[in-house]
Structures are given as structure tokens and as C-alpha cells.
């Protein structure tokens, strides 16, 4: 069964700057990744970035840099200034659309006990939705 993992990290150098990393553990080819915050995409969440493996990347504030890390994982750096900046308990979600598996989404937030610059290892987060 495919899985999605989400890792959220607060940068030690900028306490209001976050890095979100997401990955897809499955055999299919990824056609699209959508990163949102405040809940799952389409369920109250606000889209931060949409990444297509070949067409390109679209991102919106406070997202600063979205990029592919590997063919099945992405990272997103968030600026931390102004009213739209994230806070420690913000939920971030990643939805991977893959062929032939369908869509798989998982969410994560900053581990409550983590120090700035530290984070939990990138273990699979609970899968919230699998739209086949």
C-alpha cells in the first residue's frame, strides 16, 4: 500500500521559518503534489504550492521555495513574517497524485517537544485520504 510521509521542521536560524518535507512511498509515477496548510487540500486547507514533475512549480506566500528533492519527495520553505506566517501548531498536508494508485494525502505538524532545528525523523504520517 502506498504511503505519504510528512516532516515539519522549524529552522534554528529563523524561528518563524519552517521547512516541510513530504515523500511518496509507492511504485507509481507521481503526476502532481499539492502542499497546503490549515488542513487537507479541499477541506479548509489553503494551498501553498503545486508541483508538477515536468511542467514546473507554482507557489504562493508565505511559501518561499518549493522544490523536488528526489523523484518522489519535495520540500517547501516558508517565510515567517506577517499575518500569514505559520505557528508551531500549524498543520501541513501533502497530497500526491500518482498513476495508477490514485491520490494519497497525509498531514503533519511540528513535534510539540522539538527544539528549533530538530524534528522527528521522516516516518509515514497517517494517511487521511486515498481517492482512487
Amino acid at each position: 500500500t502506498p504511503e505519504v510521509w510528512v516532516q515539519v521542521r522549524m529552522e534554528a536560524t529563523e524561528l518563524s521559518s519552517f521547512t516541510i518535507r513530504c515523500g511518496f512511498l509507492g511504485s507509481g509515477s507521481i503526476s502532481l503534489v499539492t502542499v497546503s496548510w490549515g488542513g487537507p487540500n479541499g477541506a479548509g486547507g489553503t494551498t501553498l504550492a503545486v508541483l508538477h514533475p515536468e511542467r514546473g512549480i507554482r507557489q504562493w506566500a508565505p511559501a518561499r521555495q518549493a522544490r523536488w528533492e528526489t523523484q518522489s519527495s519535495i520540500s517547501l520553505i516558508l517565510e515567517g513574517s506577517g499575518a500569514s506566517s505559520p505557528c508551531a501548531n500549524t498543520t501541513f498536508c501533502c497530497k500526491f497524485a500518482s498513476f495508477p494508485e490514485g491520490s494519497w494525502e497525509a498531514c503533519g505538524s511540528l513535534p510539540p517537544s522539538s527544539d528549533p532545528g530538530l524534528s522527528a525523523p521522516p516516518t509515514p504520517a497517517p494517511i487521511l485520504r486515498a481517492d482512487l
Epitope: 494551498t47 503545486v50 514546473g56
Partner: antibody, heavy 114, light 113 residues
Framework: EVQLVQSGAEVKKPGSSVKVSCKAS????????IEWVRQAPGQGLEWMGE????????NYNEKFKGRVTFTADESTSTAYMELSSLRSEDTAVYYC???????WGQGTLVTVSS | DIVMTQSPDSLAVSLGERATINCKSS????????????LAWYQQKPGQPPKLLIY???TRESGVPDRFSGSGSGTDFTLTISSLQAEDVAVYYC?????????FGQGTKLEIK
């Protein structure tokens, strides 16, 4: 079938504003950004910016910041581009586009003339 | 901003012959993480909107004839029409799809010799 249908040609006076609409169909309007691109007569393509209808998040080309506003109405799957303080150099065909420029509207000619 | 420079500005090729258009970017368009080049090619005929031909530097958009092909990596890219047809007369643009703002080349006008 994905379609982007734009409003008709406009003739405007210098200093005024113009609002161009782009009605989308055939896909989930809120999921992909609507890009705005303009093309002056005989010239190349110039990206003005984009809006993500689902969240009304925007990105603007610095060249147009402060003069252009993008909005979107999810209920009618329509995006809008408003350009203010028009000058003769703004005479161009304005296009909306979506899904990484794979789909385009037919274009709207805006003529700025006194 | 990434500057896209196309060459030549205009090109005349005989029907059935090969047409080649070059595009150079001021910065690399290669995403090292997934080894994909974020470059697109468009065709525009008079009075029409641009039409996407190629994305990811070499992937043909659905419905585009296989005589159109894209190649290149990093900062140097090429659009090739293997056997020119009359309907290929148009202006061709390359585009940076790597970073904001998306920027286009100045265009290459392709005509029949």
C-alpha cells in the same frame, strides 16, 4: 474539454482602468492557477502574474505591481484581471491561461487611445 | 529574472526539411532533485493564442505531432521540426518554467523557403 473564454475587446482612455474576465470550464477551477499574459502588437509574450482561485493567493510580475489586480469568483469559475492607470503602451492582447500554460483563452484586445 | 534568448530571430526552411530553433537561458533550468529541466516551447499563429508544444524540455504535449521534438539541458535547449509542413509556419517561443517570473524568449519566426 477544458475551455477558457474571455470577455470582448475594449477601447479605453489613458488614465482609466479595464477589467478583463476569463470563464473556465472542464476542470476544477480552484485547483490550478490562472495566469495572465499580455502581448503588445507585433511583440512577444509577457507574464503579468497569476491567481489561485481556491485561496485567492496571487503572484505579480514586479513590473505591474500596484497597477494590476487579480480576482476570482469560484461560484462562476471566472477569473478577472483589472489594470489601472492605463497608458498607450498597455495596448495589447491580454490572455488568461491555466495548468502551466497548457490551456489558453482566445485573448482580449485592449486598446488605449485618447 | 531569468533571461531567455532565442536564435535565430527568423528562419526560412523548405517544406519537408528540418527546422531547428535554439534557446539559451541566463540560469540553469535543471532541477537537480528530480533531474528535470523546466523549459517549455510554444507555437503561435497569427490571431491565435500560443499553443503549448513541449514541456519539461522534451515531453510533447498531448496531440502534438511527433515531428516536433525538444532537447537540451541546463541552459541550452533546442526545438526541432523534423519535416516542415505548411501548417508549421508560426512564431515559436521558449519559456522558463523553472522560477518566478516565468519568462519567454523573444520569439523565432518560421517561414517557408
Amino acid at each position: 474539454e477544458v475551455q477558457l473564454v474571455q470577455s470582448g475587446a475594449e477601447v479605453k482612455k489613458p488614465g482609466s482602468s479595464v477589467k478583463v474576465s476569463c470563464k473556465a470550464s472542464g476542470y476544477t477551477f480552484s485547483s490550478f492557477s490562472i495566469e495572465w499574459v499580455r502581448q503588445a502588437p507585433g511583440q512577444g509574450l509577457e507574464w503579468m502574474g497569476e491567481i489561485l482561485p481556491g485561496s485567492n493567493s496571487t503572484n505579480y510580475n514586479e513590473k505591474f505591481k500596484g497597477r494590476v489586480t487579480f480576482t476570482a469568483d469560484e461560484s462562476t469559475s471566472t477569473a478577472y484581471m483589472e489594470l489601472s492607470s492605463l497608458r498607450s503602451e498597455d495596448t495589447a492582447v491580454y490572455y488568461c491561461s491555466s495548468y502551466w500554460f497548457a490551456y489558453w483563452g482566445q485573448g482580449t484586445l485592449v486598446t488605449v487611445s485618447s | 529574472d531569468i533571461v531567455m534568448t532565442q536564435s535565430p530571430d527568423s528562419l526560412a526552411v523548405s517544406l519537408g526539411e528540418r527546422a531547428t530553433i535554439n534557446c539559451k537561458s541566463s540560469q540553469s533550468l535543471l532541477n537537480s532533485g528530480n533531474q528535470k529541466n523546466y523549459l517549455a516551447w510554444y507555437q503561435q499563429k497569427p490571431g491565435q493564442p500560443p499553443k503549448l508544444l513541449i514541456y519539461g524540455a522534451s515531453t510533447r504535449e498531448s496531440g502534438v505531432p511527433d515531428r516536433f521534438s525538444g532537447s537540451g539541458s541546463g541552459t541550452d535547449f533546442t526545438l526541432t521540426i523534423s519535416s516542415l509542413q505548411a501548417e508549421d509556419v508560426a512564431v515559436y517561443y521558449c519559456q522558463n518554467a523553472h522560477s518566478y517570473p516565468p519568462t519567454f524568449g523573444q520569439g523565432t519566426k518560421l517561414e517557408i523557403k
